[in-house]
Interface confidence: medium
């Protein structure tokens, strides 16, 4: 018997070192995966049993010959994948019976030459992959054929020239994608693309195109249907007004010029591309943008300048420069990414003219933006910005009114900086529509009563690992945030808070309070009694109190928190939990108590929260394997559908001595009083 796995109508026989086709698979399979074996042939007679096959994948084998009768035996075959084999020749007969094929993958074989018309009968073919084969010509046949072809992949071959007579076989095709990447192209002969019925996307990445060849290419694309042109990873060191001039008579909408070591973007380089909507200039070496660099891009919606500029060297003069008004022509631009650059700072008119901009990413963009002032973003005053990413910019101070120009902003990300200040609240002046402020991973933030008084619309506030100070002031800094649904105060070593810290936050759904120091606040011996800072949070869904040193949970602290779905109390020092503390948590889905000091799991504590649990984590607790301590728990474990991972290995008895290291689930409860499962 074979070791193939069969699920529904799919047989997976991959990676089995097969030298022959298995003969005992179900006869109704429609998909057969034979990849990564040691097959040398696909004998047609061996497939007689599998006449329902629609997809046959025999990639990554050692097949050197294909017999025409295979498709006769498999009349419903639509996808044939033979990539990474040893086919060296295909003749007129090879696919003669494969009339119903829609996809044929011959990538990574040794087909150096196409003789005559091996694809003449493939009138249903929509995808043909001949990349990585050593072909020296695009000619796949004489006479018009492959009229339904949509994707022709010829990357990584040895094609030196594109000639009209070698592409005329595509005269009736509407190619959605022609990939000629990684070919050493040196010539685009006149009319070479005109012979293709329609060509919508052309990929010429890594094709060693210089500026002159690029210009020639664009003229050959003139008056075609081209919409998407990818010229990434060439040697397009400079562009000028003439580089893309041939594209004037096209409706090009996407252009990828990434990874070109592009140094000089000449004025008017894009002036002939009024239909362009997407432009990528990622990973280049641009020295300067001037007010006419983007002239003509009147319909551009998306522009990526990620890592597009010169990297700084010893000389300060090598700093890339973005002149004022460089973006002034991009009146429909909605998305601008300038991540990972070495721009010194913003100027008063850096972003002027971007009157449709919604998403601006400036992560790790600036070298001298330590202080944000009310001038930093003045050039965005007329932009309807919704999202602003300012992460990783070594920002240390935010001045009052910095964001006052951004009245429509919804998401402000200031994480992963070095902000070190007292938040007066004036920093956020004017952010009247703000939804989320992300401040996590900064140096030091001191709160005041008015820190967030000017942003009542805020729904998400992230303050993780910011050495937060003054959390215990009254009234609470969070009091104005009536709409808050997510609050992250984790990793701040907070030890002192008041009972009214979260008062009035009735809409809070997620509270992250892990990695703080709340242990004293929940002790009975705490002066003034335990601090119940969770009261009134009636819509709380997720509560994380991991790693807080907690060794007590006061009675009533979870009372009325009926909507709690997840509680994480892992990595604390909890031992004996009071009865009934989880009585209102009957809707709980996830409970994490791993790495505590829990010895007993009793019904009056855990019965209610276990009722509807999907997931329980109580690993690494020192369970006391006695009837009183765990018989109810063991019985529950053995009849529940709750997911309890690593139950066999990480739920082990600690006491009594003779049970040490014994798996909890194997504890025999039959001799325990009142242990019957129906008691649950």
């Amino acid at each position: 018997t074979n070791q193939c796995t069969v699920r529904y109508n799919v047989a997976d026989c991959s990676h089995l070192k097969l030298t022959h086709i298995p003969d005992d698979l179900p006869s109704n399979i429609t998909v057969l995966n034979l990849t990564h074996n040691q097959l040398r042939r696909l004998p047609p007679t061996n497939f007689t049993r599998y006449s329902q096959l629609a997809i046959l994948d025999a990639g990554f084998n050692s097949i050197s010959k294909l017999e025409p009768e295979l498709c006769q035996i498999l009349p419903l075959l639509k996808v044939l994948n033979l990539q990474h084999n040893e086919l060296s020749q295909i003749s007129d007969q090879t696919f003669v019976f494969c009339t119903n094929l829609t996809e044929l993958d011959l990538m990574s074989n040794s087909i150096h030459k196409i003789k005559s018309n091996p694809f003449k009968n493939q009138k249903n073919l929509i995808k043909l992959d001949l990349s990585h084969n050593g072909l020296s010509s695009t000619k796949l046949g004489t006479g018009v054929q492959l009229e339904n072809l949509q994707e022709l992949l010829l990357a990584k071959n040895k094609i030196l020239a594109l000639r009209s007579e070698e592409l005329e076989f595509l005269g009736n095709s509407s190619l959605r994608k022609l990939d000629l990447s990684s070919n050493p192209l040196k010539e685009f002969s006149p009319g070479c693309f005109q012979t293709i019925g329609k060509l919508f996307a052309l990929l010429l990445n890594n094709a060693q195109l210089n500026p002159h060849l690029t210009e020639k290419l664009c003229w050959e694309l003139s008056n075609t249907s081209i919409q998407n042109l990818s010229l990434a990873n060439n040697q397009l060191l400079a562009t000028s007004e003439s580089t893309f001039s041939g594209l004037k008579w096209t409706n090009l909408t996407q252009l990828d010029l990434s990874y070109n070591n592009l140094h000089d973007v000449g004025n008017g380089s894009f002036s002939y591309l009024p239909s362009l909507r997407y432009l990528s200039l990622e990973y280049n070496n641009i020295q300067r943008l001037s007010p006419r660099s983007f002239y003509g891009l009147s319909n551009l919606r998306y522009l990526s300048l990620k890592r597009a500029f010169t990297k700084q060297s010893v000389s300060l003069a090598s700093h890339p420069n973005i002149d004022d008004f460089s973006f002034q022509w991009l009146k429909y631009l909605e998305y601008l990414n300038m991540d990972d650059n070495n721009i010194p700072s913003t100027k008063s008119n850096t972003f002027t003219g971007l009157v449709s901009l919604k998403y601006l990413s400036l992560s790790k963009t600036f070298t001298s933006l330590q202080t944000l002032t009310n001038e930093t973003f003045v050039s965005l005053a007329h932009s309807p910005l919704l999202t602003l990413n300012l992460t990783k910019n070594h920002i240390s101070k935010i001045a009052n009114g910095t964001f006052s120009w951004l009245g429509q902003l919804r998401i402000l990300d200031l994480g992963l900086n070095e902000i070190e200040q007292k938040l007066s609240g004036q920093e956020w002046r004017g952010l009247r529509n703000i939804f989320e402020i992300y401040l996590s991973y900064n140096k030091y933030l001191q709160l005041s009563t008015s820190s967030f008084a000017l942003v009542p619309s805020l729904q998400r506030l992230m303050l993780r690992r910011v050495a937060l100070k003054n959390v215990d002031i009254s009234p609470s800094p969070f009091r104005p945030l009536r709409n808050l649904t997510i609050l992250d105060l984790s990793n701040n070593n907070i030890a002192n808070i008041n009972e009214d810290l979260l008062e009035g936050l009735e809409n809070l759904e997620i509270l992250d309070f892990q990695h703080n120091n709340l242990a004293r606040l929940w002790k009975r011996a705490n002066p003034g009694g335990p601090v119940n800072f969770l009261k009134g949070l009636s819509h709380l869904h997720i509560l994380n109190l991991e790693s807080n040193g907690l060794d007590e949970i006061p009675v009533g602290v979870f009372k009325n928190l009926f909507e709690l779905k997840s509680i994480n109390l892992g990595l604390n020092n909890l031992n004996k939990l009071e009865p009934f503390i989880f009585d209102d948590q009957t809707s709980l889905r996830s409970l994490n108590l791993q790495k505590n000091l829990i010895t007993s799991v009793e019904k009056d504590v855990f019965g209610p929260p276990f009722q509807n649990l999907n997931s329980l984590d109580m690993r690494f607790n020192p369970f006391d394997c006695t009837c009183e301590s765990i018989s109810w728990f063991v019985n529950w474990i053995n009849q529940t559908h709750t997911n309890i991972s690593e139950l066999s290995t990480h739920y082990l008895c600690n006491t009594p001595h003779h049970y040490y290291g014994f798996p909890l689930k194997l504890f025999d409860t039959s001799s325990c009083k009142d242990s019957a499962p129906f008691e649950l």
Epitope: V31, A54, I55, K78, N100, E103, I126
Partner: nanobody, 115 residues
């Protein structure tokens, strides 16, 4: 990702007609081959009819002359018109599309032919 939703099944008298529809979302029908298969209780799933990008069609012998497969690219829909129905046509009818090397199936629609 392609989603297929069949409709049009039901209970019909022998000799009657039905028109099954299959709507695809996520990928237009102009790409690839689209077919109808059927599975009677306790039997394997068998091809009924299939239509190709070129417009070519193929039919199982058991339905030839009684069924017509067609498609409307604008509506992303493929149809199976079945006439002169027989009790042996009773089955769950499934729509099938092959897209970029993946075999997609609908949930099926029940056709019951009573005598």
């Amino acid at each position: 990702e392609v989603q297929l939703v069949e409709s049009g099944g039901g209970l019909v008298q022998a000799g009657g007609s039905l028109r099954l529809s299959c709507v695809a979302s996520g990928s237009p029908f102009s790409i690839g081959a689209t077919g109808w298969y059927r599975q009677a209780p306790g039997k394997q799933r068998d091809l009924v009819a299939e239509i190709y990008p070129s417009g070519d069609t193929i039919y199982a012998d058991s339905v030839k002359g009684r069924s017509t497969i067609s498609r409307d690219n604008a509506k992303n829909t493929v149809y199976l018109q079945m006439n002169s129905l027989k009790p042996e046509d009773t089955a769950v009818y499934f729509c099938n599309v092959v897209r970029w090397g993946v075999d997609y199936w609908g949930q099926g629609t029940q056709v019951t032919v009573s005598s």
